[in-house]
């Protein structure tokens, strides 16, 4: 069963290799349990990023080393990917599923363009 | 294609206890909340118990809270119940169900009796 | 006594248009949840004939049609056809129940 999954066209990583961004569901129920799935598309190729499963009202819990961070109000999740590098350039893609109570809603987002930019080397500094 | 085989039903004294399973093929079983839903013969359709995806929450109708446990094993794609005390009012087929009743199998017919 | 109240039976000629009712409650209904209709013909399982208030899946025709309002639903059918005399059940997640309601089926004949 589809559900709209809305999230930014662009975004660019910070210096620190830093990305955020915002996935928003709209909910055609009452979900208590929402799973939420970070997917990489690079030359047509998917791999998930991370996951998370977490209760309505309590904070996204990924697995410990996972470079994904996240929180959630209402119907929005705020999606933080970490330790990003040059080569991670490529599209990201929010996916929303409603596990609890049922029935089971899906949606999968249009994606995110993440661009990152490898900082340049400091160069030596002569005193 | 969606297939939801029950089987253990059969004919048990009352009192006595009996075991349906639930092998589901055809989708992602481990995403979806499982249930059982009964019929009795000649009558409505009653949700006996349901249990969520990984699960955490399980539910039960007053009629079986205390008798029946429902369980599953998603790495078998099974779903389980385990129906104790047995009461000449358990008698009905028994149907699987996946997700809010999207699918059902075929039943199986449980019938307790003396 | 069913959480849902649905009316035992309904007739209608075939080509007419007919309505069954589904009223529930706050922790059903009335909660936002969606309502889900079935199907039951003579000697088989259910099959499920809407899903979230007004869906069709695949392979059910465009006669059958929901709606849902307040803490109601009903299912419409129209252009009645002989092979749609069957029972009909509607149900909804129930947060009190903390599982699902059905309603107590409406037996659907189709007169002459």
């Known amino acids: 069963k589809a559900m709209h999954v809305a999230q930014p066209a662009v975004v660019l990583a910070n210096s620190r290799g830093t990305a955020s961004f915002v996935c928003e569901y709209a909910s055609p129920g009452k979900a208590t349990e929402v799973r939420v799935t970070v997917l990489r598309q690079a030359d047509s190729q998917v791999t998930e990023v991370c996951a998370a499963t977490y209760m309505m009202g309590n904070e996204l819990t990924f697995l410990d080393d996972s470079i994904c961070t996240g929180t959630s109000s209402g119907n929005q999740v705020n999606l933080t990917i970490q330790g990003l590098r040059a080569m991670d350039t490529g599209l990201y893609i929010c996916k929303v599923e409603l596990m609890y109570p049922p029935p089971y809603y899906m949606g999968i987002g249009n994606g995110t363009q993440i661009y990152v930019i490898d900082p340049e080397p400091c160069p030596d500094s002569d005193f | 294609e969606v297939q939801l085989l029950e089987s253990g039903g059969g004919l048990v004294q009352p009192g006595g206890s009996l075991r349906l399973s639930c092998a589901a093929s055809?989708?992602?079983?481990?995403?979806?909340?499982m249930s059982w839903v009964r019929q009795a013969p000649g009558k409505g359709l009653e949700w006996v118990s349901g249990?969520?995806?990984?699960?955490?929450?399980?539910g039960y109708a007053d009629s079986v809270k205390g008798r029946f446990t429902i369980s599953r094993d998603n790495s078998k794609n099974t779903l389980y119940l385990q129906m104790n005390s047995l009461r000449a009012e358990d008698t009905a087929v028994y149907y699987c169900?996946?997700?809010?009743?999207?699918?059902w199998g075929q039943g199986t017919l449980v019938t307790v009796s003396s | 006594q069913s959480v849902l109240t649905q009316p035992p039976s309904a007739s209608g000629t075939p080509g007419q248009r007919v309505t069954i009712s589904c009223t529930g409650s706050?922790?059903?209904?009335?909660?936002?949840?969606?309502v889900h209709w079935y199907q039951q013909l003579p000697g088989t399982a259910p099959k499920l004939l809407i899903y979230g208030n007004d869906n069709r899946p695949s392979g059910v025709p465009d006669r059958f049609s929901g709606s849902k309002s307040g803490t109601s639903a009903s299912l419409a059918i129209s252009g009645l056809r002989s092979e749609d005399e069957a029972d009909y059940y509607c149900?909804?997640?129930?947060?009190?129940?903390?599982?699902?309601?059905f309603g107590g089926g409406t037996k659907l004949t189709v007169l002459g």
């Open positions: 055809g989708f992602t079983f481990s995403d979806y909340y």
């Open positions: 149900a909804v997640w129930d947060d009190s129940l903390n599982g699902v309601v």
């Open positions: 249990i969520s995806w990984s699960s955490r929450d399980k």
């Open positions: 706050s922790s059903n209904i009335g909660a936002g949840y969606d």
């Open positions: 169900t996946t997700d809010l009743a999207r699918y």
